[in-house]
């Protein structure tokens, strides 16, 4: 089989190592350690270029990159997440030329497929049911019933839904900060086999898409009075390393990719749908703007009014969330329970290092249209009767988040096995 | 082993349309893009199009837009072309290949088809 | 469209005695995702092309490590260190970075 679609390899000969294990071994050298200490005095307040004017800061930073350090990367979720990504964001902010429309993902790439989340997906729902043949079934409202037979998934969901939905004051909806943590947490601790039944369901009417754009409580951790413009927002998010790394991670693996099948890069749909619930309980929050069940539309909360000659950039920044076909499809082949399929020798990772230009990927025109793929699941949604939940004031919450309190077992949450040869 | 095999030679007449066929075997059909190239002479080869089996969907370089269309059947993973209107300028031996330029742009060539028009 | 300049057009190298095959693109070939989407193709007499290298610098599986690729931006060499009976064909340059993609106008490798 072709030995050429092999994954490409990361930068460099070294394998990367955690940047908080880097930085060790570069405490325990003189050289480097010094260097390291060097550098961020270079780069406390002040800006690039006068970094690079200064010979001993060029040097430290030269020095550097033959360390562990300048290769090194993060995983999500990992005990000392923030650290890491303080210790990568030292090194890398001090190499890129001030900001990049694109910027490399700190984080490492992802070797998992969707058919891996699908295999374990139909263990977790123990039943034989398949999602095609149940026309009748709610995909949104049976992930929220698989979830609620999982204790720790059913913890913290009761969690971030308590919290959201707590009202402040009459003019205060509700704790934005405490939700986005909530979110987090739930993203980032519950497996993907969970989260993701719950943020990419399948659906075919309005009822079901509502249930879907509902599942981050949009009122509390999405909407707000005005839309920032997009720029403003993506400044904010790139003062903070999560929320900085996030969006470069989403960007590394969800960028239209004019290479691949999917359009996805890597072909890999189990990376872009990570990266992008990676960005929930963030600044940077994407939700589904509308109840529409077929045309997928995600975006964060912003909008390019006020950008003046920055327009273009803010339309292009917009339209990686609104018009994306990697996502789009990988949304839709997720709610399908369909993966690509390449060959065994097929790519497993994609490198992110970052690009250094600036231009929009060159997709002919008609690429991006014709590129979703239909839905096959058919759907509909069941109205749900309140069981126990405290009062809440809205209605579409009380359809959302009834079934906290029932263990009925999911009738028909299976999702499909993707075929194992070619079709 | 993989492997593309090409339809045969086609001798036909000037605006009449010719179907070359390509069927792959020995890997993935849906993963990889299948190309198609002319090549009119000894140092000069066009780029054709593209199309996609995981989703049928298709890139044509504009020359071409109207000369050439792509289809598949992914039943018995075959790629299709059929070009159309066809005149002596469309005399060539045209090869389909497949791959994915992610993982190196293409890696297979099929033996190459050739058309010869003339009346 | 992108141009793609080979030279030289025709190349008489004896066996055993190093080559080199240019390559110039008419416009940058480094992609948004950090990748430069560069081939080099062989086409001996009578076959169809054969891909010896891509993304700039990476051998196929059983090309000879004679072959070597490099460049950036929109520069790009074949090498081949010593020259074989065998090495004898068109070689073409590739591009695949935009839309659409274009071949160099080809060198004939002779052997003296």
């Known amino acids: 089989s072709p030995s050429s679609l092999q994954g490409p390899e990361l930068h460099g000969w070294r394998p990367p190592v955690d940047c908080v294990r880097a930085n060790e071994l570069c405490a325990a050298e003189s050289n480097c350690s010094s260097r390291y200490r060097t550098l961020r005095q270079c780069l406390a307040g002040r800006d690039r270029n006068t970094m690079l004017a200064n010979k001993e800061c060029q040097a430290a930073l030269e020095v550097l990159q033959e360390s562990p350090l300048y290769d090194c990367r993060c995983k999500r979720g990992m005990k000392k997440e923030l650290q890491c990504l303080q210790i990568y964001w030292s090194i890398h902010l001090g190499l890129t030329e001030g900001e990049e429309f694109y910027e490399a993902s700190p984080y490492e790439p992802v070797t998992s497929r969707l058919s891996d989340i699908f295999r374990l997906a139909s263990i977790f729902s123990g039943t034989g049911a398949d999602p095609v043949v149940s026309a009748k079934s709610n995909h949104c409202l049976d992930a929220a019933k698989a979830c609620n037979l999982n204790d720790n998934c059913k913890k913290l969901r009761s969690s971030y839904i308590s919290i959201c939905n707590r009202e402040i004051s009459p003019t205060e909806r509700c704790n934005r900060r405490k939700c986005h943590k909530a979110l987090r947490q739930f993203f980032d601790r519950v497996p993907s086999e969970y989260t993701y039944r719950m943020l990419f369901c399948s659906c075919q009417d309005q009822a079901c898409a509502e249930r879907r754009r509902q599942t981050i409580l949009p009122s509390c951790s999405y909407e707000d009075k005005e839309k920032p413009n997009c720029l403003d927002l993506r400044g904010v998010c790139r003062t903070d390393h999560l929320c900085r790394s996030r969006l470069a991670d989403f960007h590394a693996n969800c960028r239209a990719s004019y290479q691949t099948v999917t359009s996805c890069p890597a072909d890999n749909y189990q990376a872009c749908l990570g990266s992008y619930a990676g960005m929930i309980g963030f600044d940077m929050t994407p939700n589904y703007v509308d109840s529409s069940p077929t045309g997928i539309v995600v975006s964060p909360w912003c909008s390019c009014r006020g950008s003046g000659n920055m327009e273009e950039e803010c339309e292009k920044f917009l339209r990686d969330f609104t018009e994306n076909p990697c996502l789009r499809n990988a949304i839709q082949a997720f709610g399908n329970g369909t993966d690509v399929n390449v060959s065994p020798k097929g790519p497993s990772f994609q490198a992110t290092q970052a690009p250094r230009v600036e231009k929009t990927p060159s997709l002919p025109d008609d690429l991006s249209d014709s590129t979703s793929l239909g839905t096959s699941v058919i759907t509909t949604c069941t109205s749900v009767q309140e069981q126990g939940l405290k009062a809440n004031n809205s209605k579409e919450l009380s359809m959302c988040f009834t079934e906290l309190t029932t263990n009925i077992i999911p009738g028909s949450n299976k999702v499909i096995k993707p075929n194992s040869g070619p079709s | 082993e993989v492997q593309l095999q090409q339809s045969g030679p086609e001798l036909v007449k000037p605006g009449a349309s010719v179907k070359i066929s390509c069927k792959a075997s020995?890997?993935?059909?849906?993963?990889?893009?299948m190309h198609w190239v002319k090549q009119r002479h000894v140092q000069s080869l066009e780029w054709i199009g593209r199309?996609?089996?995981?989703?049928?969907?298709?890139n044509y370089n504009q020359i071409f837009k109207d000369k050439a269309s792509l289809t598949l059947d992914k039943s018995s993973s075959t790629a299709y072309m059929e070009l159309h209107s066809l005149t002596s300028e469309d005399s060539a031996v045209y090869y389909c290949?497949?791959?994915?330029?992610?993982?190196?742009?293409?890696?297979?060539w099929g033996q190459g088809t050739t058309l010869t028009v003339s009346s | 469209d992108v141009v793609m300049t080979q030279t030289p057009l025709t190349l008489s190298v004896t066996i055993g005695q190093p080559a080199s095959i240019s390559c110039k693109s008419s416009?940058?070939?480094?992609?948004?995702?950090?990748?430069?989407?560069l081939n080099w193709l062989l086409q001996r007499p009578g076959q169809s092309p054969k891909r010896l290298i891509y993304?700039?610098?990476k051998l196929d599986s059983g090309v000879p490590d004679r072959f070597t690729g490099s460049g950036s931006g929109t520069d790009f060499t074949l090498k081949i260190s010593r020259v074989e009976a065998e090495d004898l064909g068109v070689y073409y340059c590739?591009?695949?970075?935009?839309?659409?993609?274009?071949f160099g106008g080809g060198t004939k490798l002779e052997i003296k």
């Open positions: 290949a497949s791959g994915g330029h992610y993982y190196g742009n293409v890696d297979y």
């Open positions: 020995g890997y993935s059909f849906t993963g990889y893009f």
């Open positions: 199309i996609n089996p995981y989703n049928g969907a298709t």
């Open positions: 416009q940058s070939l480094l992609d948004t995702d950090g990748k430069t989407y």
């Open positions: 993304l700039v610098s």
């Open positions: 590739w591009q695949g970075t935009h839309f659409p993609q274009t």
